[in-house]
Every structure is written in structure tokens, then in C-alpha cells.
Interface confidence: low
Amino acid sequence: PALPEDGGSGAFPPGHFKDPKRLYCKNGGFFLRIHPDGRVDGVREKSDPHIKLQLQAEERGVVSIKGVCANRYLAMKEDGRLLASKCVTDECFFFERLESNNYNTYRSRKYTSWYVALKRTGQYKLGSKTGPGQKAILFLPMSAKS
């Protein structure tokens, strides 16, 4: 299996992309997937091209998440939906935090109590239904070079 590597995705200055990543969700073992039509979900197949993501550090502790194939940016909408937009907006920035179990969480900078999350079915979880301590919000950045 692909192994995680240097996971702190924002370890370079703003504007500098690191190697592409996959975001592996603890809840069900899904990889976060961004479709070309803007849909967001999870898939277990690590060869799916739409799970290759670029995490860009915008400022200390804040990242944007771009689907490489989709050429779209993950966004948290005002109603809690996750989708991917063609352009970067203020809904496309997330606080990346290392939790006590060494998984990462991605919390919306605009809607500050809502997290990126995947259900056990592989569907995204509404931000309004997420919160600290949930398995659905825990992600591991893994190398997508292979």
C-alpha cells in the first residue's frame, strides 16, 4: 500500500505546492475525491485519478485543497455542502490542524465550526453535522506520487 509521507502539507511558503497528496479518511478508509463536475466524495480505490490533490499553504496553518485532475478547489458552502469550485473563493480555505492521534483535520476558515468530513458510505458529511472528536473529520495525507 501507499505509505504516508511528510504529512504536514503546509510546510512550504504561500504559493509553493508540494508533491500531490491523497487524503485518507479514518472513517471507512476512503480517499477524498474531487470530480471534474465539482462533486466531492470518497473512494477506496487508490488508483482513482481524482483523489490526487495539491494542498497549498496560503498562510500559517491554512491550506487550499485542489483536485489535480478536476482543476477545482475544495469549498465549504454556507449550507454545509462540500463541493469543488473552478475559482478560489473565501470558502476554499481550511485550517489544517494536527490532532492528538496524529491525524489531520481541515476546518473551514469561513464557517469556523465546520469540518471537511466523509461518512462511512463514502459520501461527504454536511459541515453542519461535523464536530471535534468525530472519526469522519480525521485525515492522513498520503503520497500520491506513485
Epitope: 504536514g8 510546510a11 504561500p14 500559517r60 496524529n102
Partner: nanobody
Framework: QVQLVESGGGLVQPGGSLRLSCAAS???????????GSWFRQAPGQGLEAVAA??????????YYADSVKGRFTISRDNSKNTLYLQMNSLRAEDTAVYYC??????????????????WGQGTLVTVSS
């Protein structure tokens, strides 16, 4: 470049004990494990599971354990040796997995947008069988 090397895996009978070590090299100023480290495992056909962590996130020197290993496994570190340990007692067949250590370290501040980075070892196999 930071390198992590695990050791201590092997075959053990149910109820037995093993101690895994994770030695770090290539660190600057011995800072690698002062920020914390953890152990993950991956059983055949399963996903990665966080087993234990120490000193990660905002928790200082606190420890974390998965429910399945609480009371049996103990994570510790020796900063002077830049080594992370996992003491595993009362081992069960379901503990069979490849165990990976991770270490958290601080990049040079002028390069850091997010200061904490993570390095992974290559894994050591633990087999619990009679």
C-alpha cells in the same frame, strides 16, 4: 534528511510481549521527537489504524491510545537517543500487522507555513501466532 528506522518486530505467541523501537537520524538540534511521535499499524487487507501517540498536536507530552490497545500498549520516547518506543504486552492475534512509526518535527521557521511536518518509517511486521 530525516530518516526513521523501526526495529523489534517479529513472531510472538499470544500473551507475549514485544518492544518496538523507532530510531531517528538526520535531525537538527535533536528536535525531532520533542514535538511528538506515534505508531500506526496496518493489518492485512485493512486500513491504517492509529495505535498510540505522544506529545502531538496541542497536547504537550500527553499520550493517546486506541481503545483496542489501552492497558496493553505503552508509548514512550527518549529524546536523548531520538528514539520512540512501543511496549506491547498481552499480545493477541488481532494485533498482527505491519507497524509504522511516525515522528513530528519542526521545519526551519523561515520555510514553514505550517510548522509541523511528519516523517514515516518503512514499517516492521509483528505476527502474533501460536
Amino acid at each position: 534528511q530525516v530518516q526513521l528506522v523501526e526495529s523489534g518486530g517479529g513472531l510472538v505467541q499470544p500473551g507475549g510481549s514485544l518492544r518496538l523501537s523507532c530510531a531517528a537520524s538526520g535531525t537538527e538540534d535533536g528536535r525531532l521527537l520533542t514535538l511528538g511521535g506515534s505508531w500506526f499499524r496496518q493489518a492485512p487487507g485493512q486500513g491504517l489504524e492509529a495505535v498510540a501517540a505522544i506529545g502531538a498536536g496541542d497536547r504537550g507530552g500527553a499520550t493517546y491510545y486506541a481503545d483496542s490497545v489501552k492497558g496493553r500498549f505503552t508509548i514512550s520516547r527518549d529524546n536523548s537517543k531520538n528514539t520512540l518506543y512501543l511496549q506491547m504486552n498481552s499480545l493477541r492475534a488481532e494485533d498482527t500487522a505491519v507497524y509504522y512509526c511516525t515522528a513530528l518535527y519542526e521545519r526551519q521557521p523561515q520555510l514553514a507555513a505550517t510548522k509541523v511536518a511528519r516523517k514515516w518509517g518503512q514499517g516492521t511486521l509483528v505476527t502474533v501466532s501460536s
